[in-house]
Amino acid sequence: LIIGFGISGKHFITVTTFTSAGNIGEDGTLSCTFEPDIKLNGIVIQWLKEGIKGLVHEFKEGKDDLSQQHEMFRGRTAVFADQVVVGNASLRLKNVQLTDAGTYTCYIRTSKGKGNANLEYKTGAFSMPEINVDYNASSESLRCEAPRWFPQPTVAWASQVDQGANFSEVSNTSFELNSENVTMKVVSVLYNVTINNTYSCMIENDIAKATGDIKVTDSEVKRRSQLQLLNSG
């Protein structure tokens, strides 16, 4: 969370950004809020990126102005125009690429004053893991798969019954490059699992942490997955 202040004569407004992460090949959002101003035509929003000449995006007088937009962002950005009057200057980014990572500045000018705040945008790939019982194995085993990760993550197993146990000796993890030659599919197999236990497969890189849980009993298999972006707030 970054809060910036700006001074315009005697006036300053608070601009707030949130460190966020983009999943390559998908839509991303660069979050920025400011003190609302009901006079839409008096609001100017400028998004800038460190190291890039020209603007990422500009919105003024109630509409987009792309006359100074850098070519790498052409056709890839939009503000949430209907939410600008309530103080939302967040930017929607199409087809996030690794090269979109960096420091962005959200600059705001309204009839109340002006202000800006920086935002650190990380890019990579992250996805939910799915755990299944591998009945093909000679002994009962679990297979944890997640289709897209970058940079290469670490994978660890845990169990409710054997808390603190190290499963690295009884698991095997592989990383398979996907067709676009950037992201990788993560596959981890845990051997010699026991019934009536809950196992967790944890995948983590510097952008995200994902956990898949599976509870295997005689009568049913229960699964749960969650994904958490790191350093977002």
Epitope: G25, D27, K63, D64, L66, G75, S179
Partner: antibody, heavy 121, light 107 residues
Framework: EVQLVQSGAEVKKPGASVKVSCKAS????????IGWVRQAPGQGLEWIGD????????NYNEKFKGRVTITRDTSTSTAYLELSSLRSEDTAVYYC??????????????WGQGTLVTVSS | DIQMTQSPSSLSASVGDRVTITCKAS??????VAWYQQKPGKAPKLLIY???TLQPGVPSRFSGSGSGRDYTLTISSLQPEDFATYYC?????????FGQGTKVEIK
């Protein structure tokens, strides 16, 4: 309500040029990309290119580069497709379409009625 | 440039059938795949965008899925008004590209 109204059918001779218009209403013309797509008789859809009326920025299918020009007139909220050096295989229905997402180039969500261009000697 | 290979080119089905149409992208990964329905003499109609988001007003029997290079349009229970030609569109790249189309006919 978003509406795209295209100009009428055209018959042209090989080697000539054609200019098709697409008049937009029901939204802020300068805020949304407009694309052009064609469909030859009994064939599939083929993307030609698009324009951002707010700045005049264009993207073109490599297949048509050098022969196609997409322009706009913001005073009349009209986009134009001009295709030169016409040949018989350019005979098709030409559609204009608005791209969703305003300055973000999205999928084509509203379409014109189509303009039949016939190239015949 | 990303090309989209659509299959099958045509299929015959009955009312109530489940129908699946696929598109394969020539490269890369992005979720920017849309699906259109077109009837003879009419402009295409947007059904689904961003792989799986249903366009407002489109019946819920239409659904989209996919990841990586493979994308699918499913009609869960074919209705009489669904007999038409369907196209996928890749719109994540700078240059857009349609699939060749799939004609859904009455068996």
């Amino acid at each position: 309500e978003v509406q795209l109204v295209q100009s009428g059918a055209e018959v042209k001779k090989p080697g000539a040029s054609v200019k098709v218009s697409c008049k937009a209403s029901g939204y802020t013309f300068t805020s949304y990309w407009i694309g052009w797509v064609r469909q030859a008789p009994g064939q599939g859809l083929e993307w030609i290119g698009d324009i951002y009326p707010g700045g005049g920025y264009t993207n073109y299918n490599e297949k048509f580069k050098g022969r196609v020009t997409i322009t706009r007139d913001t005073s009349t909220s009209t986009a134009y497709l001009e295709l030169s050096s016409l040949r018989s295989e350019d005979t098709a229905v030409y559609y204009c379409a608005r791209l969703a997402g305003s300055s973000y180039r999205g999928a084509m969500d509203s379409w014109g009625q189509g303009t039949l261009v016939t190239v015949s000697s | 440039d990303i090309q989209m290979t659509q299959s099958p080119s045509s299929l015959s089905a009955s009312v109530g059938d489940r129908v699946t149409i696929t598109c394969k992208a020539s490269q890369g990964f992005n979720k920017y795949v849309a699906w259109y329905q077109q009837k003879p003499g009419k402009a295409p109609k947007l059904l689904i965008y961003y792989t799986s988001t249903l366009q407002p007003g489109v019946p819920s029997r239409f659904s989209g899925s996919g990841s990586g290079r493979d994308y699918t349009l499913t009609i869960s229970s074919l209705q009489p008004e669904d007999f038409a030609t369907y196209y996928c569109l890749q719109y994540g790249d700078l240059l857009y590209a349609f699939g060749q189309g799939t004609k859904v006919e009455i068996k």
